[in-house]
């Protein structure tokens, strides 16, 4: 058993049939010695008397808010949550495995630039009685500060018969150094509490590995006289790190015909303009990636050719 | 470069960008492999990193690029020695068309661009001996290449910025 926060305790349980559970001793936070009784949740039924209450915690029926009373007045509370371990593995019932980029990916994180700001998100099918808290640091043995904002419900989607909820959080490294080579990874820890179930999820990454630029902006097409060719231009996204002479992007461009099956020629360039043949009903697209480190490509930005 | 002369920024830019390409072709799936393990915070101390105080940011380069260039050169020599060590030459043998050979040569080439003949900066000691097991060697290769990718990315940014803003 360990204290998650004031008056909230997590009991770690090996979860198998007829498991013995954990013996927990609760102590009433009061100078009083006599006439103390204990109850659980909204029930007024007395579970025991005395300054301490010893319980055998085996399952969720044993978890909840224990309160000690004297003379009809509540003296202190202890909320017991359970953290299940099955076959040596902590339960992951609350969050959905996103399976990208690999199995057992519950938290996904992205950064739009090297400023030390990043966003993490996760998915669940649970709609009520759910709370999350997030902590983050750079490194774990001698952690450096990362400040995370409030967790927000960022999207709701219908997946077949189920509704899926996406939660996200934004974090900022306190003393980010965009130009340096990261030596220690960022650690993100999410505590999830669903009713009386506690779970925790972690992710460890370098900002450089989770970079995904925003799509290029201001796509423009300029037809060339007496030619089927068009000069296309675009700009770095506003959210990308500056100066661009230092934080450079590379681009992938393509012209896509109306038919998805039509062959697309992709061209890679470090410039912010190109000359392409852009037929009627086709569209021109461009995406961006860090020029020197192969992290994610941005989403495509597109304009119609006509 | 030592003693305050400017490097051939444009040449360094080209070669460092080539290094980036080679480092990724030597170990392309790096983003999908989680090679970090318990205790990695300690093992990463072995390799030289371009850190915050090394003056490799745009402002630091403008003020005095020498600190940064010295740091980059130290790292290049360190990785060049690693790629020439039995970590990479021992079993399991690299494929004949492996880019590691080119990568090794390019590291040497760029480090020489930063130090003309006759100048000798102190360099870091080569790290501890190579592991004996082939599988350990393979894992160490991946870790070194992953670390090299991060190092050469910063170096390439430095030379690109230098070529654009500091070239005479």
């Amino acid at each position: 058993i360990w204290e998650l926060k004031k008056d909230v305790y997590v009991v770690e349980l090996d979860w198998y049939p007829d498991a013995p559970g954990e013996m927990v001793v609760l102590t009433c936070d009061t100078p009083e010695e006599d006439g103390i009784t204990w109850t659980l949740d909204q029930s007024g039924e007395v579970l025991g008397s005395g300054k301490t209450l010893t319980i055998q915690v085996k399952e969720f029926g044993d978890a909840g808010q224990y309160t000690c009373h004297k003379g009809g007045e509540a003296l202190s509370h202890s909320l017991l949550l359970l953290h299940k371990k099955e076959d040596g593995i902590w339960s992951t019932d609350v969050l959905k495995d996103q399976k990208e980029p690999k199995n057992k990916t519950f938290l996904r994180c992205e950064a739009k630039n090297y400023s030390g700001r990043f966003t993490c998100w996760w998915l669940t099918t649970i709609s009520t009685d759910l709370t999350f808290s997030v902590k983050s640091s750079r490194g774990s043995s001698n952690p450096q500060g990362v400040t995370c904002g409030a967790v927000t419900l960022s999207a709701e989607r219908v997946r077949g018969d189920n509704k899926e909820y996406e939660y996200s959080v934004e974090c900022q490294e306190d003393s980010a150094c965009p130009a340096a080579e990261e030596r220690l990874p960022i650690e993100v820890m999410v505590d999830a509490i669903h009713k009386l179930k506690y779970e925790n999820y972690t992710s460890s990454f370098f900002i450089r590995d989770i970079i995904k630029p925003d799509p290029p902006k201001n796509l423009q097409l300029k037809p060339l006289k007496n030619s089927r060719q068009v000069e296309v231009s675009w700009e770095y996204p506003d959210t990308w790190s500056t100066p661009h002479s230092y934080f450079s992007l590379t681009f992938c461009i393509q012209v896509q015909g109306k038919s998805k099956r039509e062959k697309k020629d992709r061209i890679f360039t470090d410039k912010t303009s190109a000359t392409v043949i852009c037929r009627k009903n086709a569209s021109f697209s461009v995406q961006a990636q860090d020029r020197y480190y192969s992290s994610s490509w941005s989403e495509w930005a597109s304009v119609p050719c006509s | 470069v030592p003693g305050g002369s400017s490097p051939a920024w444009a040449q360094c830019q080209q070669l460092s960008q080539k290094l980036c390409t080679l480092a990724w072709s030597a170990h392309p799936l790096v983003g999908h492999m989680d090679l970090r393990e318990e205790g990695d915070e300690e093992t990463t101390n072995d390799v030289p990193h371009i850190q915050c105080g090394d003056g490799c940011d745009p402002q630091g380069l403008r003020d005095n690029s020498q600190f940064c260039l010295q740091r980059i050169r130290q790292g290049l020599i360190f990785y060049e020695k690693l790629l020439g060590s039995d970590i990479f030459t021992g079993e399991p043998s690299l494929l004949p068309d492996s880019p590691v050979g080119q990568l090794h040569a390019s590291l040497l080439g760029l480090s020489q661009l930063l130090q003309p003949e006759g100048h000798h900066w102190e360099t870091q000691q080569i790290p501890s001996p190579s592991p004996s097991q082939p599988w350990q060697r393979l894992l160490l290769r991946f870790k070194i290449l992953r670390s090299l990718q991060a190092f050469v990315a910063v170096a390439a940014r430095v030379f690109a910025h230098g070529a654009a803003t500091l070239s005479p």
Epitope: D41, Q42, S43, E45, G61, G64 | -
Partner: nanobody, 122 residues
């Protein structure tokens, strides 16, 4: 809908024995403490005995040494074995259980049975 149904109450001679049973049924997620209370005519309802989920019993002074509370968690039942009954044990005996239901599956609330009459004649 949750129901607590008591049984076993009847007229018995002083010094005799009775066994009361209570079964909880309906949509029940889990049961915490289960208890027996009684209310004699013109008096307040008083606790007789309680048993926790783990099986620890607790008795009111009037029940000590004569009454035994037991429960079967698998069947959601609680029993009260009453020996050496006295006329002052005459009362309606109520079963009480702290239940979690699907609506409140992480909060225990108290549910009561309708009661069973025990009469001890001298």
């Amino acid at each position: 809908e949750v129901q607590l149904v008591e049984s076993g109450g009847e007229l018995v001679q002083a010094g005799g024995s009775l066994r009361l049973s209570c079964a909880a049924s309906g949509s029940i997620v889990s049961i915490s403490a289960m208890a027996w209370y009684r209310q004699a005519p013109g008096k307040q309802r008083e606790r007789v005995a309680t048993i926790t989920r783990g099986g620890t019993p607790d008795y009111a002074d009037s029940a000590k040494d004569r009454f035994t509370i037991s429960r079967d968690n698998a069947k959601n039942t609680v029993s009260l074995q009453m020996n050496n009954l006295k006329p002052e044990d005459t009362a309606v005996y109520y079963c009480k259980a702290a239940l979690r239901t699907p609506t409140h599956d992480y909060n225990y609330y108290d549910y009561w049975g309708q009661g069973t009459q025990v009469t001890v004649s001298s």
